[in-house]
C-alpha cells in the first residue's frame, strides 16, 4: 500500500502524478479519494 | 500470463442495446481495475470506462455517460459493458484492459467489434 | 482542457534511430503520460509511463531499445536500431481525477514506417 504521507513527501513528482498514483491505488483498495 | 478474452460484438441497429463480455484468467481478478478502450475503423483509442476491482466505483468519459454501464461478477472472473441507445459512432472493436499499480492499460484482450448500422 | 498532439506519420531506416514525440497541453506540461504500441491488425500493448522528469518503467516484454525522455510539455519515445516489427502505430495517453472524476485521452497516434 502507498500511504498518503509517502506520497506527499516523495520529492520531484508533479501533483498529477502523485493524483495517478493515488487513483490507481484507489482502483485496486477501493479507497475513497475525496 | 495475463489473459484477456472479449465476446459479444455483432451488428445491431441505431437505438438498440448490446452487452460485451470479457473473460479474465491468469491472475487474480478481484484485486485489480479493469477498463474499456475502443478504437473505430481506422481511427485512433478512446477510453470507454473504468471499475475499481470490487465494482464500487466506475468511471466514464461524457460521450457514453448514461448510456454505457461497466460492470464486474468476481465470481466469474468476467468484466461487461452493457451498451444502451447505440449510435453509428459507437462502432469500433471494443478492447478490455487490466491495471497494475503502476499503469492503467497494462494488458489488452484481442477485442470484439460492434458495428450499428440499419 | 487536456489534449495530447502527435504527428501523424514517421518515417526511419532499417537500424536508425527513432524519436517519436507527444506534446501536452502547456497548463499541463508537468503530467505523466503512458506510450502505447499497436502493430497491424493487433490489439495495442503497453509501452511505458513517462514522468515530467524523464524518468520511465516499461511494460513487460518491451525490448531495451526502447526509451523515453521528457523536455517542457514534449514527451518522447526513442526506438533505437530499429526493426521491422517497429512498424506499427504509436498512442500516448494520459490520465488525471478532478473532484473524484476520471478523464483518459489518447494523442491521435503516429504511424511508424520502418524503411528498408
Known amino acids: 500500500a502507498v500511504s498518503e504521507h509517502q506520497l506527499l513527501h516523495d520529492k520531484g513528482k508533479s501533483i498529477q502524478d502523485l493524483r495517478r498514483r493515488f487513483f490507481l491505488h484507489h482502483l485496486i483498495a477501493e479507497i475513497h479519494t475525496a | 500470463q495475463v489473459q484477456l478474452v472479449e465476446s459479444g460484438g455483432g451488428v445491431v441497429q441505431p437505438g438498440r442495446s448490446l452487452r460485451l463480455s470479457c473473460a479474465a484468467s491468469?491472475?487474480?481478478?478481484?484485486?485489480?481495475?479493469m477498463s474499456w478502450v475502443r478504437q473505430a475503423p481506422g481511427k485512433g483509442l478512446e477510453w470507454v470506462a473504468t471499475?475499481?476491482?470490487?465494482?464500487?466505483?466506475?468511471y466514464y468519459p461524457d460521450s457514453v455517460k448514461g448510456r454505457f454501464t461497466i460492470s464486474r461478477d468476481n465470481s466469474k472472473n468476467t468484466l461487461y459493458l452493457q451498451m444502451n441507445s447505440l449510435r453509428a459512432e459507437d462502432t469500433a472493436v471494443y478492447y478490455c484492459?487490466?491495471?497494475?499499480?503502476?499503469?492503467?492499460?497494462?494488458?489488452w484482450g484481442q477485442g470484439t467489434l460492434v458495428t450499428v448500422s440499419s | 482542457q487536456l489534449v495530447l498532439t502527435q504527428s501523424s506519420s514517421a518515417s526511419f531506416s532499417l537500424g536508425a534511430s527513432a524519436k517519436l514525440t507527444c506534446t501536452l497541453s502547456s497548463q499541463h506540461s508537468t503530467y505523466t503520460i503512458e506510450w502505447y504500441q499497436q502493430q497491424p491488425l493487433k490489439p495495442p500493448k503497453y509501452v511505458m509511463d513517462l514522468k515530467q522528469d524523464g524518468s520511465h518503467s516499461t511494460g513487460d516484454g518491451i525490448p531495451d531499445r526502447f526509451s523515453g525522455s521528457s523536455s517542457g510539455a514534449e514527451r518522447y519515445l526513442t526506438i533505437s536500431s530499429l526493426q521491422s516489427e517497429d512498424e506499427a502505430d504509436y498512442y500516448c495517453?494520459?490520465?488525471?481525477?478532478?473532484?473524484?472524476?476520471?478523464?483518459?485521452?489518447f494523442g491521435g497516434g503516429t504511424k511508424l514506417t520502418v524503411l528498408g
Open positions: 484492459a487490466r491495471q497494475t499499480t503502476m499503469t492503467y492499460f497494462a494488458y
Open positions: 471499475i475499481s476491482s470490487g465494482g464500487s466505483y466506475t
Open positions: 495517453g494520459v490520465g488525471d481525477t478532478i473532484k473524484e472524476q476520471f478523464v483518459y485521452v
Open positions: 491468469g491472475f487474480t481478478f478481484s484485486s485489480y481495475g
